[in-house]
Interface confidence: low
């Protein structure tokens, strides 16, 4: 993989420890928290990033609760269990033996239970809606220009294939970015929409995960696009299972 050889760092993940102890003295990087080797030529999985983040904890955050089958990450930060490939394990438990099932982006999709709770499979999040509100500008952004700039960003910064950016909607001041990626569409080597959305979320909050890169400077035809709030909705291939109590 391509960790920067000269000073042995991981361009796509600053939450790593790198050393020239790979085969042939090549630079090898391991994620903080898990110690797992990461591929520095692409995005690191959200599970490993959350685990790394928990090794240097910050305050958890809470997001607004949406309706229907869309999930929002209301539970904030937790120390996740990741599988050998860096994906979230379907069942997550905390230190007090409270367990729950998560989707492929690590968001809880069932009520919390005890150690007897079964999560048969990791359910894929196939549709992510990123809802942004931008700060007031002199005029509305041109929709075509805004669309092109956001597509360019997801392609060049997050290495997400443009076919997974299903739509960019704009009604000033709200921008909605729809990411869609079914299990059948995701080929080996494709960046996962959940990972791209997480990197984007952290960029928007000024907490870039990239090594040594400046923060995100989003401009549309030279005009700065400054985001003042972000909401991310997750839709799974199989609807979540919550008790009626939670829905009322």
């Amino acid at each position: 993989h391509t960790a920067a050889q000269d000073n042995c760092t991981c361009p796509t993940n600053k939450m790593t420890v790198c050393s020239p102890d790979g085969p042939g003295g090549r630079c090898q990087c391991r994620a903080l928290g898990s110690g797992m080797a990461v591929d520095c030529s692409t995005l690191t999985s959200k599970c490993l990033l959350l685990k790394a983040r928990m090794s240097a904890p910050k305050n958890a955050r809470t997001l607004v609760r949406p309706s229907e089958h869309a999930l929002v990450d209301n539970d904030g930060l937790y120390d996740p269990d990741c599988d050998p490939e860096g994906r979230f394990k379907a069942r997550q438990c905390n230190q007090t033996s409270v367990c729950w099932c998560v989707n492929s982006v690590g968001v809880r999709r069932t009520d919390k239970g005890d150690l007897s709770l079964r999560c048969d499979e990791l359910v894929r999040t196939h549709h992510i809606l990123i809802d942004l509100r931008h700060r007031p500008t002199a005029g509305a952004f041109n929709h075509s220009d805004l669309d092109a700039e956001l597509r360019r960003l997801f392609r060049e910064r997050y290495r997400l294939h443009p076919k997974f950016v299903a739509a960019v909607h704009y009604e000033q001041p709200t921008i909605q970015i729809e990411l869609r990626q079914n299990t059948s569409q995701k080929a080996a080597g494709d960046v996962d929409i959940g990972d791209a959305a997480y990197y984007f979320e952290r960029d928007i909050k000024g907490e870039s995960l990239f090594q040594g890169r400046g923060g995100l400077d989003l401009r549309v035809r030279g005009e700065p696009l400054q985001v003042e709030r972000t909401l991310i909705y997750y839709l799974d291939e199989i609807p979540p299972k919550f008790s009626m109590k939670r829905l009322t």
Partner: antibody, heavy 121, light 107 residues
Framework: EVQLVESGGGLIQPGGSLKLSCAAS????????MNWVRQAPGKGLEWMGR????????HYNQKFKDRVTMTRDTSTSTVYMELSSLRSEDTAVYYC??????????????WGQGTTVTVSS | AIRMTQSPFSLSASVGDRVTITCKAS??????VAWYLQKPGQSPQLLIY???YRYTGVPDRFSGSGSGTDFTLKISRVEAEDVGVYYC?????????FGQGTRLEIK
């Protein structure tokens, strides 16, 4: 300048085949589907299919499925369309046009000038 | 395949007139409809996409509306340069399909 330039048209015998080229410049080809649309003399527009220049994924109009092949050469930002078993009804202007990924953007914002194909003995 | 039916087939207008062209889809296409103008001897050019978004550089006398199955292109004040054939296209699903075209002439 964003540009698409088609070439390869001309007079072709019935039963023969054609291979048209579309050279793209002024934009990142990998960010777009590259489409072929044709227009018979005095008639409307007909979508033939498209190719994703990243991985050569193709979607063809069922009408042409058995006769059309679309390919690409990323090193030259060129896409190709081959049409076989030509008949007189294939006489048309053939356009190359780009469209975005995601169905919200499957419209054609840039078109080539078109290349004329005449099928006649 | 989704069929797109345009009307009228042709129309004649004077400079300054208001013109309306309609397009009907054979099934619900949400707002995924684009409009093009093909001037004589030229390639088609995009005017409107997603039913109502004017493409960059298109004069504001062109406007689009509609959703579901019924769509409209309006030209508020026709100019001499607007002559040609107007096509609607659904960009909802493949195969992508066009209307048969509406020819606009200037009286």
């Amino acid at each position: 300048e964003v540009q698409l330039v088609e070439s390869g048209g001309g007079l072709i015998q019935p039963g023969g085949s054609l291979k048209l080229s579309c050279a793209a410049s002024g934009f990142t080809v990998s960010n777009y589907w590259m489409n072929w649309v044709r227009q018979a003399p005095g008639k409307g527009l007909e979508w033939m299919g498209r190719i994703d220049p990243n991985d050569s994924e193709t979607h063809y109009n069922q009408k042409f499925k058995d006769r059309v092949t679309m390919t690409r050469d990323t090193s030259t930002s060129t896409v190709y369309m081959e049409l076989s078993s030509l008949r007189s009804e294939d006489t048309a202007v053939y356009y190359c046009a780009r469209s975005g990924f995601g169905s919200t953007y499957w419209f054609f914002d840039v078109w080539g000038q078109g290349t004329t194909v005449t099928v006649s003995s | 395949a989704i069929r797109m039916t345009q009307s009228p087939f042709s129309l004649s207008a004077s400079v300054g007139d208001r013109v309306t062209i309609t397009c009907k889809a054979s099934q619900d296409v949400s707002t995924a409809v684009a409009w093009y103008l093909q001037k004589p001897g030229q390639s088609p050019q995009l005017l409107i996409y997603s039913a109502s978004y004017r493409y960059t550089g298109v004069p504001d006398r062109f406007s689009g509306s509609g959703s579901g199955t019924d769509f409209t292109l309006k030209i508020s004040r026709v100019e001499a340069e607007d002559v040609g054939v107007y096509y609607c296209q659904q960009h909802y699903s493949t195969p992508l399909t066009f209307g048969q075209g509406t020819r606009l002439e200037i009286k």
